[in-house]
């Protein structure tokens, strides 16, 4: 594990995997299905979707003082998106295109979350509703919206790990 007993993570490993996540999130976005992009408007996601915010300790000072606050927040987000990508939203009709990187993205989210999960320590994770949207048009649009939210999330996470790898690695 990268965070044995709650000490520092393997920053370089996390940096590499988070950069891969960024690439996959951007490449997955246009490949989740054919749709009319007019719905790709300017609506904001709400606070129910994990964001990395000022009070989460992900700034350089916060990471220096105690990186656990920030890492827990990132871990919660990774689990949130990992569950969504494994849900019926992505597995139900309409089927993903054969060359969609969503499967790889799902596996990489799980991989990074495992790197961050301390041995014998279980961070609280956000509850994901167990019931799926029932209509294909809903799933198709939600895929775009979820991936767009995920892009923003992993971009911030990647910056955190890049900073950690550059300044906090042993």
């Amino acid at each position: 594990r990268a965070v044995p007993g709650g000490s520092s993570p393997a920053w370089t490993q996390c940096q590499q995997l988070s950069q891969k996540l960024c690439t996959l999130a951007w490449s997955a976005h246009p490949l989740v299905g054919h749709m009319d992009l007019r719905e790709e408007g300017d609506e904001e996601t709400t606070n129910d979707v994990p964001h990395i915010q000022c009070g989460d300790g992900c700034d350089p000072q916060g990471l220096r003082d105690n990186s656990q606050f920030c890492l827990q927040r990132i871990h919660q987000g990774l689990i949130f998106y990992e569950k969504l990508l494994g849900s019926d939203i992505f597995t139900g009709e309409p089927s993903l295109l054969p060359d969609s990187p969503v499967g790889q993205l799902h596996a990489s989210l799980l991989g990074l979350s495992q790197l961050l999960q301390p041995e014998g320590h279980h961070w609280e994770t956000q509850q994901i509703p167990s019931l799926s949207p029932s209509q294909p048009w809903q799933r198709l649009l939600l895929r775009f919206k979820i991936l767009r939210s995920l892009q923003a999330f992993v971009a911030v996470a990647a910056r955190v790990f890049a900073h950690g790898a550059a300044t906090l690695s042993p």
């Epitope: 009319d36 129910d48 979707v49 019926d88 509703p129 019931l131 949207p133 209509q135 048009w137």
Partner: antibody, heavy 121, light 107 residues
């Protein structure tokens, strides 16, 4: 008993605002995706807006986008529709509806009784 | 948007008759079609989902069939309480759209 109960309708002038509420009971509201559907007097049904079960993502019909905002408070088992910049063509009975909670269905299984919104000067 | 066209607009039939309503989609929607019944001043009630699945509690005289672009709702033995408007709805593509409705009257 599974139930949806809308409120907040009324008469409003063009350009005005209204906030509709839909109180849910008899089911675990936070697990369900919800919608608003409207019906102009003597006309057919028109889908208006959708919100994901956690409230994280919303979708709107082109006719209301930028003017209406759907939201929910899962702790209060309530769905909302904030309607701004109302127009005469928004005059309708507004229904909240629940999605069937299975990916192989594709329909609205529970509807409220509706609340009438009249936009007129 | 996918256009849903119902026919006939109105139909009048006697108690015990078999009644059929047709719904046509402007493009293929696979089997993603639902049928609703609406009585005056009331909310719509789901009858059929996924083209042919009967909603729980709906009498077995109601049935749905079809796929692609052409769908039918049948009532095998019309009852007085079936006097209502019937709407089809496609759930395949954004935005979800409804047919204009068919009014069923009892002679």
């Amino acid at each position: 008993e599974v139930q949806l109960l809308e409120s907040g309708g009324g008469l409003v002038q063009p350009g005005g605002s209204l906030r509709l509420s839909c109180a849910a009971s008899g089911f675990t509201f936070s697990h369900y995706t919800m919608e608003w559907v409207r019906q102009a007097p003597g006309k057919g049904l028109e889908w208006v807006s959708y919100i994901y079960s956690s409230g994280g993502w919303t979708i709107y019909a082109d006719s209301v986008k930028g003017r209406f905002t759907i939201s929910r408070d899962n702790s209060k088992n309530t769905l909302y529709l904030q309607m701004n910049s109302l127009r005469a063509e928004d005059t309708a009975v507004y229904y909240c509806a629940r999605d069937i909670p299975t990916s192989s269905a594709g329909a609205f299984d529970i509807w409220g009784q509706g609340t009438m919104v009249t936009v007129s000067s | 948007d996918i256009q849903m066209t119902q026919s006939p607009g109105t139909l009048s039939a006697s108690v015990g008759d078999r009644v059929t309503i047709t719904c046509r989609a402007s493009q293929s929607i696979s089997s993603w079609l639902a049928w609703y019944q609406q009585k005056p001043g009331k909310a719509p009630k789901l009858l059929i989902y996924k083209a042919s699945s009967l909603e729980s509690g709906v009498p077995s005289r109601f049935s749905g069939s079809g796929s692609g672009t052409e769908f039918t709702l049948s009532i095998t033995s019309l009852q007085p309480e079936d006097s209502a408007s019937y709407f089809c709805q496609q759930a395949n593509s954004f935005p979800p759209t409804f047919g204009q409705g068919t009014k069923v009257e009892i002679k």
